[in-house]
C-alpha cells in the first residue's frame, strides 16, 4: 500500500486459487484405510482451498480397492460448494486387494477424457491416496510411463497408519509410493504417519497443486 | 507394424544354461507403453509365464522360476533376452516372446528348445 | 498364485452352434485384468479380448466376453470353421500372471 493508502500490488491468498487445473484424486478405498472420516476431512480441507468451476479449477474423483469406481466426474459439479457436499457423501467401497496401478490408469484412461470433463489445453493433476503396497504393483511402470506420456502431474501420499500400527517396515511401500510421483520427489511426495495426519499436509499440498499453474 | 522373432540354440544339455534373445522390429523397444516377455509351453499343455521386462531394466519374475531366470533388455540392438540356467527335461518347451500392454498382443512365432544329452 | 480353471476342457460343437466358455479364478480378479487367447495347432495365441469384454484389433464380433469376480466366460455366438481352436483365460492383475488349462472347441 503506497503513502496515499492506493493499492500498489496484491497476493492472492493460496486458497483463492482460480487457475485453470483438471485434478482428478484417486483414493484407495480398501479395506485397510480406517477411518474413513479422515479421508472426506482431508479431502474437505483440500477442496474448500479451491475455486471450483467450469473456467476454473475442475476435480474429480476416483475410488479404487479390487475394482475402480468414478465417484464424480471433473464437470459434475460446477462450484466449490457443491464439489464439497459430493465429497462428504462418498462412501468406502472397500476390497481385500489394492489395486493401484489399476486406479490410475483408469484415471488416466478414462477420468480425465473430454467425455468426463477434461479440457484441452488445461493441466491435468493427479492426487494418488494410498495406504498400501499394490498387488499390482508389477504394472506400475507402464501406468506411470503412460502418465508422464500424457503430461499428467502427480502427487502421492503414502499412508503409513496400517504398517505402524502392525509394526511393519514401510520400506519397501514407500519406495513404491514415491515411484509414482512426478519428479521431482521431494515436491510430489507426501507421507503421513496415519490417517489421521493427512489434514496436515493439506495446506503444502495446494500450495504445490496451485503452484503448477504459476 | 510391430513383429517379434525369438531366436536361439535348439538342444540344450541337462545343466546348462538356455540362452534365448527376441528380436523386435516395426517398432521400438524403448516406447514405454509395454512389458516384453517369454512364455513357454511344454508339450501338449498350456502355458506358463517366466517373466518380463520394462524398457528401463526393470523385471518381474514367476516365483516358480525365478532362481534360475534372467531377463534383459539391449534398447540399443532392440532386443530382449531370457537365460534360464540349470535345465532338466522339464525345461523342454516351445518358447514364445510377446509384447504385453493389455494383454499380450504380439507374440513371436515361437521356438522349440529340447534339453537333451 | 491366482488359480484359473477352465471348463469343460473339450466343447464338441457343429458351425454355426454357439460355444460359452468358463473361466473361474481361485480369488477375485478384477475385470480390467483378464483377457482371453485363441490358439491353433502350431501356432503363437492370438489375442481375443481385453478387460474381460473389449474385442482386440481385427478380432469378430462373434467373439464376446462378460464376467466379474471369479467367474468369467467367452461366448462365440456362431462358430465358423476357423474358431475351432484352444481357448485360454489370462489374469495379469497379481504376480505371477497365470493362465487357464485351456478349452479345446473341436468339430463334432
Known amino acids: 500500500v503506497s503513502p496515499t493508502f492506493q493499492v500498489v500490488n496484491s497476493i492472492a491468498p493460496v486458497q483463492e486459487c482460480s487457475t485453470q487445473l483438471d485434478i482428478v484424486i484417486v483414493l484407495d478405498g480398501s479395506n485397510s484405510i480406517y477411518p474413513w472420516d479422515s479421508v472426506t476431512a482431508f479431502l474437505n480441507d483440500l477442496l474448500e482451498r479451491m475455486d471450483i468451476g467450469p473456467k476454473q479449477t475442475q476435480v474429480g474423483i476416483v475410488q479404487y480397492g479390487e475394482n475402480v469406481t468414478h465417484e464424480f466426474n471433473l464437470n459434475k459439479y460446477s462450484s466449490t460448494e457443491e464439489v464439497l457436499v459430493a465429497a462428504n457423501k462418498i462412501v468406502q467401497r472397500g476390497g481385500r486387494q489394492t489395486m493401484t496401478a489399476l486406479g490410475i490408469d483408469t484415471a488416466r484412461k478414462e477420468a480425465f477424457t473430454e467425455a468426463r470433463g477434461a479440457r484441452r489445453g488445461v493441466k491435468k493433476v493427479m492426487v494418488i491416496v494410498t495406504d498400501g503396497e499394490s498387488h499390482d504393483n508389477h504394472r506400475l511402470k507402464k501406468v506411470i510411463q503412460d502418465c508422464e506420456d500424457e503430461n499428467i502431474q502427480r502427487f502421492s501420499i503414502a499412508i503409513l497408519g496400517s504398517y505402524n500400527r502392525g509394526n511393519l517396515s514401510t520400506e519397501k511401500f514407500v519406495e513404491e509410493i514415491k515411484s509414482i510421483a512426478s519428479e521431482p520427489t521431494e515436491k510430489h511426495f507426501f507421507n503421513v504417519s496415519d490417517e489421521l495426519a493427512l489434514v496436515t499436509i493439506v495446506k503444502t499440498l495446494g500450495e504445490r497443486i496451485f503452484a503448477l499453474e504459476a | 507394424q510391430v513383429q517379434l522373432q525369438e531366436s536361439g540354440p535348439g538342444l540344450v544339455k541337462p545343466s546348462q544354461t538356455l540362452s534365448l534373445t527376441c528380436t523386435v522390429s516395426?517398432?521400438?523397444?524403448?516406447?514405454?507403453?509395454?512389458?516384453w516377455s517369454w512364455i513357454r509351453q511344454h508339450p501338449g499343455k498350456g502355458l506358463e509365464w517366466i517373466g518380463y521386462i520394462f524398457y528401463s531394466g526393470s523385471t518381474y519374475y514367476n516365483p516358480s522360476l525365478k532362481s534360475r531366470v534372467t531377463i534383459s533388455v539391449d534398447t540399443s540392438k532392440n532386443q530382449f533376452s531370457l537365460k534360464l540356467s540349470s535345465v532338466t527335461a522339464a525345461d523342454t518347451a516351445v518358447y514364445y516372446c510377446?509384447?504385453?500392454?493389455?494383454?499380450?498382443?504380439?507374440w513371436g512365432q515361437g521356438t522349440t528348445v529340447t534339453v537333451s544329452s | 498364485e491366482i488359480v484359473l480353471t477352465q471348463s469343460p476342457g473339450t466343447l464338441s460343437l457343429s458351425p454355426g452352434e454357439r460355444a460359452t466358455l468358463s473361466c473361474r479364478a481361485s480369488q477375485s480378479v478384477s475385470s480390467s485384468y483378464l483377457v482371453w487367447y485363441q490358439q491353433k495347432p502350431g501356432q503363437a495365441p492370438r489375442l481375443l479380448l481385453y478387460d474381460a469384454s473389449s474385442r482386440a484389433t481385427g478380432i469378430p464380433d462373434r467373439f464376446s466376453g462378460s464376467g466379474s469376480g471369479t467367474d468369467f466366460t467367452l461366448t462365440i455366438s456362431r462358430l465358423e470353421p476357423e474358431d475351432f481352436a484352444v481357448y485360454y483365460c489370462?489374469?495379469?492383475?497379481?504376480?505371477?500372471?497365470?493362465f487357464g488349462g485351456g478349452t479345446k472347441v473341436e468339430i463334432k
Open positions: 510377446a509384447r504385453d500392454g493389455y494383454g499380450m498382443d504380439v
Open positions: 489370462q489374469q495379469y492383475g497379481n504376480s505371477p500372471l497365470t
Open positions: 516395426g517398432g521400438s523397444i524403448s516406447r514405454g507403453n509395454y512389458y
